[in-house]
Structure formats: structure tokens, C-alpha cells
């Protein structure tokens, strides 16, 4: 196995929930076999670790939720990589393996006495972020009846309960945004549309759903093309020339694309002088990302995009922005992160990093350039889902009893899954969180429009919403020219 | 976990090799979550179990191969299903998990004494058959540096060593048959070709390779279509009408398809009266299968197909056909298989199955309707590869020593992988077995042609071969009309 000793964040409790967050970036290609991860991440990593710790504190301080039961956690780093996440998941299930080893008499003591374990089993797992990684993790967890609740894995494949029975998510399947895109096309009577998608699961399955739904609505997908996100200029130019050949009839280009594919298209438009010739309709790979449009705003103007609805969680910032390395000792990655974030050395600290010359001064604060993780609400909702599922299970198995009764020792993953699937509660954004028969959550999207707001000033503005099948659009805003 | 107690075939030895064979069919949809498998299988199951047991006997009795070391095995049932195979693979790695548990002090004895284990670790795994299942298994095994040698998993994805480092195979990647198909197209100067593929990894990646290679050779893939194997008549008819619309220019249809997709096309040709209009070029999903052409021979005439080269292994039949349920007790599935094969009850036997009314009589023999598993040679070559890899490793780590020296206790999976990748030996069919840098074996295919051999008598005949890039064709045979 990897020589890397894996760090874990623990919080004690009567019931332990596992979590997989990408605390570090993926291993680089040359480090893949050692499973040696990249640099520490703030949004997708440290913020999610802190969200888990703080949300559990909130749950544990709530007399109405799991009274007399404390929830603890074991947080592990997935590094946004299947092999690492799988290795970490094996740690989650180790306990189940060992208990069955003992049943089978494969672990014995020299004198014949019985052995005991010093670690509580994990009852469920939150995460990981990536769909492809979540699939691998689910393949393993479902063998042990361990429910998994994802906070950003949106692939349609994961809706298949024959394959992924113990998988649930507080985000919608990408099929929902395909539906939203079709509804926009319908609303504006665009009957003849070109289509582009990024090679890979996200783009391919998304575009397939878009095409199927379009066909049912009598929308003609005139021509359909695919391209790799990292394709060269030549490939993008070739694609743009094909799209140009279908003008003016197919002016609308539906793009189920990763952000960098959209950027490649915009750059090709610039090279071929095609700014303003197309109206792009983009999926949430584009959303409201500035790294997609930077330097190519003129080409992007008019673009309509889909964005998952998830407002900032203000109370998380209240907690997070006060954290300091000298007091936040329960997060084992925090000192490493602090030094990386401020490019300085924490002198005299356990994890002092000598690669930084400058010493960290005490006036540093996380408020500087703070951006909350865009998926924060989903992460917290996933944790709450697990708590409410356990709460409902306790209510039904231990009526009139506060705490863990014998019927909940050990926790039966099948019963927990049933309880989780029936869970509904008010999520952090005020929306109802609930799960359909596939363990998916309702689709709630904002419709964004990229506009020229003033001379050389461009921005995304919210022009509508799509909530579980209902499209609302501010048509005047979509079609109005710039607000000078 | 599943309430099913998993049966295992064991053979003791100094070194234990794991194997995954589809001893039973996949679980039906309603049994998937219990991972309750289907009926017992002869070719893909029982024959492979017996091949492993007998091949290890041959190896152990060979004084030139691993002298003073006996190879044993632990054979598990994959049921041609990812979840079952993964569950079984966890059993293979359990030992590694427990030994590290002990290092970490997570398993302790009540009186503080040390615990011991009663099971040898697995050094490598043979199988499983299916690519998608092999991928899942590899994801797990590589975390523990356990080499895996596959005997029929041909997906191109598995060549990616950044993803699947510990995976090797004695069969070629499907990229090779795509190359073979392109070489046939080139040979006959077919410059304008239609293409069809089955939805799913096999068809999609195969067709993608075929298209890429065709483009480089200046072959125009006029139109490309995909279809599900289980698509309805309407879908097949629609596809055939599209193909018809490109006649006569695109008469050749290259089909990277599963057998049942080809059958669907043949049936649609009958319905639309298109027999003889196309020349089909099929991948090894069609090969020389009669279940593809039965009842639709006229439509299939002229078809050229690719088939993996694998002659029968005569010495295996010598062993296998003599097996009887009263004496073959080491194969735990054999009695179940015997009763299933002859639809009778083994009275007084441990696994007597009361669902059969008829009692098995003693004159029954496996010779009746015997067909050797078409992949038998590959299964045996995979086992030999493991043995030769271990042999070479022993020679380099224990020079001048017969048996397992300390340097091989425990066996280091990384070193074993290196040794396996350098292995080359003469396989059961007399061909050289060796592995390229991706752990793949050379491509050796037979080119088959489906012909009318006489009035209403049709068959596949061998009209050529493709051996590691070299195409040989008997052109006269291909283009001659039927031999009446």
C-alpha cells in the first residue's frame, strides 16, 4: 500500500458518521501509484471539514434532534481520486470486516481468549464530491449496507438503484438540468438547435438526455458534436466552422459542457471572428464562472446558463472566519492549510513548514479574500439528512426512549437506508430536502444570463429559475440590451 | 451483507493464488441486492474451476517450474457481477487488512496476548471474465499491490496503467481487433463505409478506435449509428432504413457489436427485404456464434467476422471428461453442476437437490454434448503466467535456493508485478505469451466468413488471420460463391 500515512479528523460520539472530502488536490500523474496527493484545498477541502465538525456541534447542541445521542465523525481525504477514496473507504469498512473475521474464527488469541476492537463502526458516509469517485465508493459501501449521501455528485448513472442501492444525494441528477435546458429552448420556440458536449460521462449522458427530451418535444437537434475539454485550438476551430456552416438557421448552440470546453469555444469564436453569431445555452459546467469568460466576455455575451441554487450559509462563515491555527487543533490539516493560504511559516507549531521563509503574523485572518465553497449548503444538508434519518429511525425503533436503545445496537444499515429515504426537513437555504425513489433530490436551478452591464463591464445576472419542473423567466431582462 | 454464505474452492499450497470465475450466472434484477446468483454455468464456470485445479496440479508436478514450492488456490464465484466480485475480492484482501489492523493495535486480546491468523494471503488473482467487473476488482486489488491477470477482459480502458497498474491480461485489447477490421477494409479498398456499434463500453470504445484508425488511413466513415442490443424492432428498422439510404455507395457496414445487436440487424433486414444488400464486417461479439445467425442465415451470408484465436486444449478434456460427482469432492460446486447439467437428483449426496424428480444414473458422462469453453486456453495461460512470474521472481530473489527464501516472505506485490510484466513463455496453443508495457498480450485473431456451403446449409469458415499487425487473407475463398 501507499507509504503515505493517512491523516484523519475524528470527533467522538455515540454514532460515528464517515465523510470523504477532497482536502487535497488529485495526485499528479507521476504520483498516482503512490497515491500521493497534491496541495491542500480550501473550498472543496478545509471548509468542508470545518462544516462537518461545526454542523455536528450544532446537531449535538439541539435538544430536538437525536436527544441523548451525540454524533461523531471520521473525516478522510479523498483527494478527488478514486484510488485514494477507495483506500480510505476500506478504512471505514475495516471494522465490519474484522467483526466478521471473528465470527468466522479467523482471528484468534494465542491463549484462545476472545479479541476486542477499539473503534466504533461507521453507520453512513457523507461524500465524496466527484461522481466517478462516488461510484467507486458506493460499489464498496453497499456491500456492507452503509448508506452514502453525496453533496455534489450529480451524474445520472447514480440514479440507478439496481446498481447503487445505498446511494443518495442532496443534489439533483443532471437529467434535471437537461430538462431545464429543454424547457428554455421550448419557451423561446427555438425549434432548430445545434448541440455540443464535452467528451466524458458528464457531457455525454447530459447531452443524451437533452437530445431524448428534445425529440419528445419536437425540437430538432440539427447537428451534434463532441470535443475534449483539453482539445487543441485546431479542434475547436474545426468545430466552430461546422457550427458556422449551420448559420443562420441553427443560431442556438446548446452546450452540455465543462467550463473549459465553453472557454475553448469562446476563444475559437474570437479567432474566427464569430462573436455575436451564436446564442449559447450552457449547463452548470459553465454556470456563473468567471474563469470561463475572462478575456472573452464579448464572445460570451447573451449566453444563458444553468446554475445549481445554493446561497451562502452565513452562519458557517460566522464560525469559519474566526478559526485560528493556535486554537483549531481538532482539524489535523488546518496548520498545513494556514501556511499554504498565507504562504508563511507557523513557527514553533507541530506542522511548521520550512519551505516558507516568511513567518505567519498574528494579524492574519480568513476574512481576507474569503469565498465560501459554492456547494457548502449541500454539504451541510447531507450531514443534516444523516442526522434526521437517524432521528426518525430512533423514534420508530426506540419509542418513548431518549438515546440509543438495544434495537439500535448495532445500527442496521438497511433500516437506516429506509429511514433516510423517507426523510424530509427544511434545508439550510429554506428549501425542503427530500428524496425520490432513486435517492435523488429535486432540481432547483437559477438561470443566469451573461450581459454587458456597462462599457467593458460584463456580469452574470439572474434571469430566472427552474424549480422541480417549473420554469420562471424574466423575458424582458433576457432580451434587453445592456443597462448603461 | 448478503445472507448468502459464499462457497470457496481451496487447494493448499506454499503460495496461494486467488481466482474469480463466473461459476453461476448473474443475479436476476430482483435478486441483485441480495447478490443471489443465478444458475450454475459449465463453460464459464465449472470448466474454469477445474482448469485452475488441474493446471496447478500440473505445475506442482513439474520439477522445472517452482521447484520445492507448491502453488495453491482460493477460487471464488464472481457471478459475472461487480457487486459479487467486489464482495469476494474483499475476502481476498481481508488478510492484508487484518495484519495492518494488528500493526495499528486495533485488534487486541482480552489478556493482552497477541492474536494470530489462520489464513495465507493471496499473492495474485486470476480473472474475472468481464471487463466491467475486472475494472471494479482491479480498483480494489491495486490498493494492496495484488497483481491481477485476466483471461477474457478485453476492454481498451484496461490498458491505462495510470488507472489500472496491477492489471495484466493474456488476451489483447479490443483496440487490436479494431485495427484488424481497419486492415480488412484497407485490403479490399472499401473507402466509404457505414458504421454501427452497440451502446455500452465494448461497442463505443471499439467503434471510436475503428473510426480514429480509419480516419488516419483515409477511409471515410460515411455515417455512424449506435443502438442498444435489446432495442425494439422499430429501432432496428429505423437504423436499417438509414443504412439503406446510403446504398449503393456505403455497402459495407462495419459493426462493432455484441452478438445480439447483429441478430437484431439481420432480423430487420428480413423484415425490410434487404438480404444481400450489405456486406457486414463484424467484431468478435459476433465471431462464429450460431445463436447470432440461427434462422437468419440468408441475411448473414457474406459477413466477415473477427474471432479470438484459441484452439481447444486437448489435455484439459482428457482430465475433465473423466470427472464424476462421487470422486470429485474438492470442487464444492460440482454436485450442483452435475444435477443441473443432467437434470437429475444425486441421491444420498451432501448437495442432493430435491427439485429434480429423476435420479442420476451411474452411466452419465460429461462427454455427452461436450463443448470446451472457448476461452480455456486463455484461462490456463493466465495461471501459467502467474506461475512463471513467481518462478522468475524466486530465481532472482533466492539465487541457488530451491523453495521460498526469506526474501520472498511475504511476497512483495510490486516485485511480483515487475516479474510478471517481464514473463514470456510458450502458451498452451504453442504461441509466445508475453506482455507489453500496458500489460496487454499480442492480438491474434482468426478471420471468419459466413457462407452458404450447400443448399440451405450455412457455416463459418476460416478465411484468414491477423497476428499482431499482420493480416493474411484467402481472397479467393472470401469472394467465391457457395461450394455446392
Amino acid at each position: 500500500q501507499s507509504s503515505e500515512r493517512r491523516v484523519v479528523a475524528h470527533m467522538p460520539g455515540d454514532i460515528i458518521i464517515g465523510a470523504l472530502f477532497s482536502v487535497h488536490h488529485q495526485p499528479t500523474v507521476d504520483k498516482v501509484h503512490e497515491r500521493k496527493c497534491g496541495a491542500v484545498r480550501e473550498q472543496y477541502g478545509i471548509q468542508r471539514v470545518e462544516a462537518m465538525l461545526h454542523t455536528l456541534e450544532r446537531i449535538n447542541s439541539d435538544p430536538t434532534l437525536l436527544p441523548n445521542i451525540t454524533l461523531g465523525c471520521e473525516i478522510r481525504d479523498s483527494c478527488w481520486h478514486s484510488a485514494v477514496a477507495l483506500e480510505q473507504s476500506i478504512e471505514f469498512i475495516r471494522d465490519s470486516l474484522i467483526s466478521s473475521e471473528e465470527e468466522e474464527g479467523l482471528v484468534r488469541c494465542v491463549d484462545g481468549s476472545s479479541s476486542f476492537r477499539s473503534k466504533k463502526p461507521i453507520v453512513g458516509v457523507i461524500g465524496p464530491g466527484s461522481s466517478s469517485v462516488a461510484i467507486q465508493v458506493q460499489n464498496l459501501l453497499q456491500l456492507f449496507n452503509i448508506p452514502q449521501i453525496a453533496y455534489s455528485a450529480t451524474s445520472m448513472d447514480l440514479s440507478d438503484k439496481t446498481l447503487f442501492k445505498y446511494f443518495m444525494r442532496v443534489v439533483p441528477s443532471d437529467a434535471q438540468q437537461a430538462r431545464a435546458m429543454v424547457d428554455i429552448v421550448k419557451r423561446y420556440n427555438w425549434t432548430y438547435v445545434s448541440a455540443v458536449h464535452t467528451e466524458g460521462n458528464y457531457g455525454e449522458s447530459g447531452m443524451e438526455a437533452f437530445k431524448d427530451m428534445s425529440a419528445k418535444e419536437g425540437i430538432c437537434i440539427a447537428h451534434s458534436y463532441k470535443i475534449y475539454s483539453n482539445a487543441g485550438e485546431q479542434s475547436f476551430d474545426k468545430l466552430l466552422k461546422k457550427l458556422r456552416s449551420h448559420l443562420p438557421k441553427a443560431r442556438v448552440v446548446a452546450c452540455f459542457c465543462e467550463g473549459m470546453t465553453v472557454r475553448g469555444l469562446l476563444m475559437a469564436m474570437r479567432r474566427l471572428g464569430l462573436a455575436g453569431e451564436f446564442l449559447l445555452l450552457g449547463s452548470d459546467g459553465w454556470a456563473d464562472r468567471y474563469d470561463v469568460t475572462d478575456g472573452y466576455q464579448r464572445e460570451a455575451v447573451g449566453g444563458i446558463t444553468i446554475k445549481l441554487q445554493s446561497p451562502d450559509v452565513k452562519w458557517f462563515d460566522d464560525y469559519y472566519l474566526k478559526l485560528r491555527p493556535e486554537t483549531n487543533l481538532r482539524n489535523p490539516w488546518f496548520q498545513e492549510f494556514w501556511q499554504h493560504r498565507f504562504q508563511c511559516r507557523l513557527e514553533g507549531f507541530a506542522q511548521e513548514n520550512s519551505k516558507y521563509n516568511k513567518t505567519c503574523n498574528s494579524s492574519l485572518t480568513l476574512r481576507t479574500h474569503h469565498v465560501q465553497d459554492s456547494k457548502m449548503g449541500f454539504v451541510i444538508n447531507a450531514i443534516y439528512s444523516m442526522a434526521y434519518g437517524l432521528h426518525n429511525m430512533q423514534m420508530s425503533l426506540c419509542p418513548g426512549y431518549a438515546g440509543l436503545c438495544d434495537a439500535m445496537k448495532p445500527i442496521d444499515g438497511r433500516k437506516l437506508l429506509d429511514s433516510l429515504m423517507k426523510t424530509n426537513f427544511t434545508g439550510v437555504s429554506g428549501d425542503m430536502i427530500l428524496f425520490d425513489e432513486n435517492g435523488d433530490s429535486p432540481g432547483r436551478y437559477e438561470i443566469m444570463n451573461f450581459k454587458e452591464m456597462g462599457k467593458d463591464y460584463f456580469d452574470y445576472i439572474n434571469v430566472g429559475s427552474w424549480d422541480n419542473g417549473e420554469l420562471k423567466m424574466d423575458d424582458d431582462e433576457v432580451w434587453s440590451k445592456k443597462n448603461n | 451483507q448478503s445472507s448468502e454464505r459464499r462457497v470457496v474452492a481451496h487447494m493448499p499450497g506454499d503460495i496461494i493464488i486467488g481466482a474469480l470465475f463466473s461459476v453461476h450466472h448473474q443475479p436476476t434484477v430482483d435478486k441483485v441486492h441480495e447478490r443471489k446468483c443465478g444458475a450454475v454455468r459449465e463453460q464459464y464456470g465449472i470448466q474454469r474451476v477445474e482448469a485452475m485445479l488441474h493446471t496447478l496440479e500440473r505445475i506442482n508436478s513439474d520439477p522445472t517450474l517452482l521447484p520445492n514450492i507448491t502453488l495453491g488456490c482460493e477460487i471464488r464465484d464472481s457471478c459475472w457481477h461487480s457487486a459479487v466480485a467486489l464482495e469476494q475480492s474483499i475476502e481476498f484482501i481481508r488478510d492484508s487488512l487484518i495484519s495492518s489492523e494488528e500493526e495499528e493495535g486495533l485488534v487486541r486480546c482480552v489478556d493482552g496476548s497477541s492474536s494470530f491468523r489462520s489464513k495465507k494471503p493471496i499473492v495474485g488473482v486470476i480473472g474475472p471474465g468481464s471487463s466491467s467487473v475486472a475494472i471494479q476488482v482491479q480498483n480494489l486489488l491495486q490498493l494492496f499491490n495484488i497483481p491481477q491477470i485476466a483471461y477474457s477482459a478485453t476492454s481498451m480502458d484496461l490498458s491505462d496503467k495510470t488507472l489500472f497498474k496491477y492489471f495484466m491480461r493474456v488476451v489483447p485489447s479490443d483496440a487490436q481487433q479494431a485495427r484488424a477490421m481497419v486492415d480488412i477494409v484497407k485490403r479490399y479498398n472499401w473507402t466509404y463505409v457505414s458504421a454501427v456499434h452497440t451502446e455500452g463500453n465494448y461497442g463505443e470504445s471499439g467503434m471510436e478506435a475503428f473510426k480514429d484508425m480509419s480516419a488516419k488511413e483515409g477511409i471515410c466513415i460515411a455515417h455512424s449509428y449506435k443502438i442498444y442490443s435489446n432495442a425494439g424492432e422499430q429501432s432496428f428498422d429505423k437504423l436499417l432504413k438509414k443504412l439503406r439510404s446510403h446504398l449503393p455507395k456505403a455497402r459495407v457496414v462495419a459493426c462493432f457489436c455484441e452478438g445480439m445487436t447483429v441478430r437484431g440487424l439481420l432480423m430487420a433486414m428480413r423484415r425490410l427485404g434487404l438480404a444481400g444488400e450489405f456486406l457486414l464486417l463484424g467484431s468478435d461479439g459476433w465471431a462464429d456464434r450460431y445463436d447470432v445467425t440461427d434462422g437468419y442465415q440468408r441475411e448473414a451470408v457474406g459477413g466477415i467476422t473477427i474471432k479470438l484465436q484459441s484452439p481447444d486444449v486437448k489435455w484439459f478434456d482428457d482430465y475433465y471428461l473423466k470427472l464424476r460427482p462421487e470422486t470429485n469432492l474438492r470442487n464444492p460446486w460440482f454436485q450442483e453442476f452435475w444435477q443441473h447439467r443432467f437434470q437429475c437428483r444425486l441421491e444420498g449426496f451432501a448437495q442432493e437437490n430435491s427439485k429434480y424428480n429423476k435420479t442420476c444414473n451411474s452411466s452419465l458422462t460429461l462427454r455427452t454434448h461436450h463443448v470446451q469453453d472457448s476461452k480455456m486456453g486463455f484461462v490456463i495461460n493466465a495461471i501459467y503466467s502467474m506461475a512463471y512470474g513467481l518462478h522468475n521472481m524466486q530465481m532472482s530473489l533466492c539465487p541457488g535456493y530451491a523453495g521460498l527464501c526469506d526474501a520472498m516472505k511475504p511476497i512483495d506485490g510490486r516485485k511480483l508485478l515487475d516479474s510478471l510484466m517481464k514473463t514470456n513463455f510458450t502458451g498452451v496453443s504453442g504461441d509466445m505469451i508475453l506482455f507489453d508495457e500496458n500489460g496487454d498480450s499480442p492480438g491474434r485473431y482468426e478471420i471468419m466468413n459466413f457462407k452458404e456451403m450447400g443448399k440451405d446449409y450455412f457455416d463459418y469458415i476460416n478465411v484468414g488471420s491477423w497476428d499482431n499487425g499482420e493480416l493474411k487473407m484467402d481472397d479467393d475463398e472470401v469472394w467465391s460463391k457457395k461450394n455446392n
Partner: antibody
């Protein structure tokens, strides 16, 4: 059961200082709570002053506080204190200690009975 | 800053009647809204949190609703004992705020 009790309210001269104490019983600060101070001037509404997170000691103040109020906690004594300096007549109010709970964001499910602070010369 | 505007400042309602109090936030508070009842000389009492969840032991005659920036509290079947001042409070953040409470609504029962 869970209870909060404020003490330290008094008649103080303008520009004077005061320390108010909130003692918790029935629950422990070693768990995680936002403990807050809220005041209410005679005949007026509720006005939030400050909160402290018991597990980390992080503090939060209303924008108008301007450094005149300091909140702190003692985990061992299970107390939260509010130090008030440079008092003026506008600070005359009943000062309540409140505990925020769990999933309701900052929702105060437990209040003390209040302690009266009068600023007068 | 999150300013909470409560209307009306006072209201009279007959016994058995229904009263609705509104609370508007200056920006979305994601349903992190609580309602309190305070009687003269007493401490405030939590009625509702998360916009619509009834606190333990509170009568179902009290009903909270709303989302985003607009919230309301309805009390049906008014009883004399419901005479009190009612406050809304945003619970989404305690950073960069002047006051988390609304100005209060005095409810007089006739």
C-alpha cells in the same frame, strides 16, 4: 433541567463599568453552544449585544458595540460574562442571557430571567 | 447588515379572532427566522424557529410561514393569554449586524 441565571445588575454612574455574569446549569459549556447577551430598555424592544461560541471562545458583537462590551466564558465554571465600560443612560436596560441551539441557526430556546442595569448619576 | 422590519407595531384583535404579523428582512435569510412571545416583566419565550417549526410545548394555534425575505406569524383562535409583544429574529448570521430582532408587535386582545 437547563437553566440560565444572570447576576451583577446594579445602579451605576455614567462612565462607570460593570460585569454581568450568566451561570448555566443542566448543561455543560464543554459542549457547543452560542451563548448570547440581549438587552431591553424600559418599554422598548429586544436588542442583541454579543455572542460567544462556548467550544472555541470565538466572539461576535453587534455593529454598534464599539469595544465597550466584552463577552467571555469560563468552561470550568460554566459561566458567561459581559463586561460593560463607559456606561451611559442609554445602557439602562434589563440584560438577558440566552442560549442558541442547533439547527435553528441562532434561535434562542433558553433565556435567563434578566438582570437590571440602571445608569444614573 | 440584516435589518428586520416588523409590521404592524401594534394590533388589536378580538378573542377567537386571527392576527397576522409580518416580518421583512433586508436580504434573504434562508428561513432562519424565529418568533418570540414576551409578556410584561417576563423573559421572551421561543414560539417558532426555522420560519415554521413549532418549539416544544407551543400551541398549534401559532403558525409561522414565509421564505426568502418575507415571513409571517399567524395566531388563530386568539385567547386573552396571547396578549403580549411578539418579536421576529433572524438567525442566519451574527456577523456584521446591528440587531437580530425586529422592532416588535404589541398584540392587544379585546
Amino acid at each position: 433541567q437547563e437553566q440560565l441565571e444572570e447576576s451583577g445588575g446594579d445602579l451605576v454612574k455614567p462612565e462607570g463599568s460593570l460585569t454581568l455574569t450568566c451561570t448555566a446549569s443542566g448543561f455543560s459549556f464543554s459542549n457547543y453552544y452560542y451563548m448570547c447577551w440581549v438587552r431591553q430598555a424600559p418599554g422598548k424592544g429586544l436588542e442583541w449585544i454579543a455572542c460567544i461560541y462556548t467550544s472555541s471562545g470565538s466572539t461576535y458583537y453587534a455593529n454598534w458595540v464599539n469595544g465597550r462590551f466584552t463577552i467571555s466564558r469560563s468552561t470550568s465554571l460554566n459561566t458567561v460574562t459581559l463586561q460593560v465600560t463607559s456606561l451611559t443612560a442609554a445602557d439602562t436596560a434589563t440584560y438577558f442571557c440566552a442560549k442558541s441551539f442547533g439547527v435553528g441557526g441562532y434561535s434562542f430556546n433558553l433565556w435567563g430571567q434578566g438582570t437590571l442595569v440602571t445608569v444614573s448619576s | 447588515a440584516y435589518d428586520m422590519t416588523q409590521t404592524p407595531a401594534s394590533v388589536e384583535v378580538a378573542v377567537g379572532g386571527t392576527v397576522t404579523i409580518k416580518c421583512q428582512a433586508s436580504q434573504s435569510i434562508s428561513s432562519y427566522l424565529s418568533w418570540y412571545q414576551q409578556k410584561p416583566g417576563q423573559r421572551p419565550k421561543l414560539l417558532i424557529y426555522r420560519a415554521s417549526t413549532l418549539a416544544s410545548g407551543v400551541s398549534s394555534r401559532f403558525k409561522g410561514s414565509g421564505s426568502g425575505t418575507e415571513y409571517s406569524l399567524s395566531i388563530s383562535g386568539m385567547e386573552c393569554d396571547d396578549a403580549a409583544t411578539y418579536y421576529c429574529q433572524q438567525g442566519t448570521t451574527i456577523s456584521d449586524v446591528d440587531n437580530v430582532f425586529g422592532g416588535g408587535t404589541e398584540v392587544v386582545v379585546k
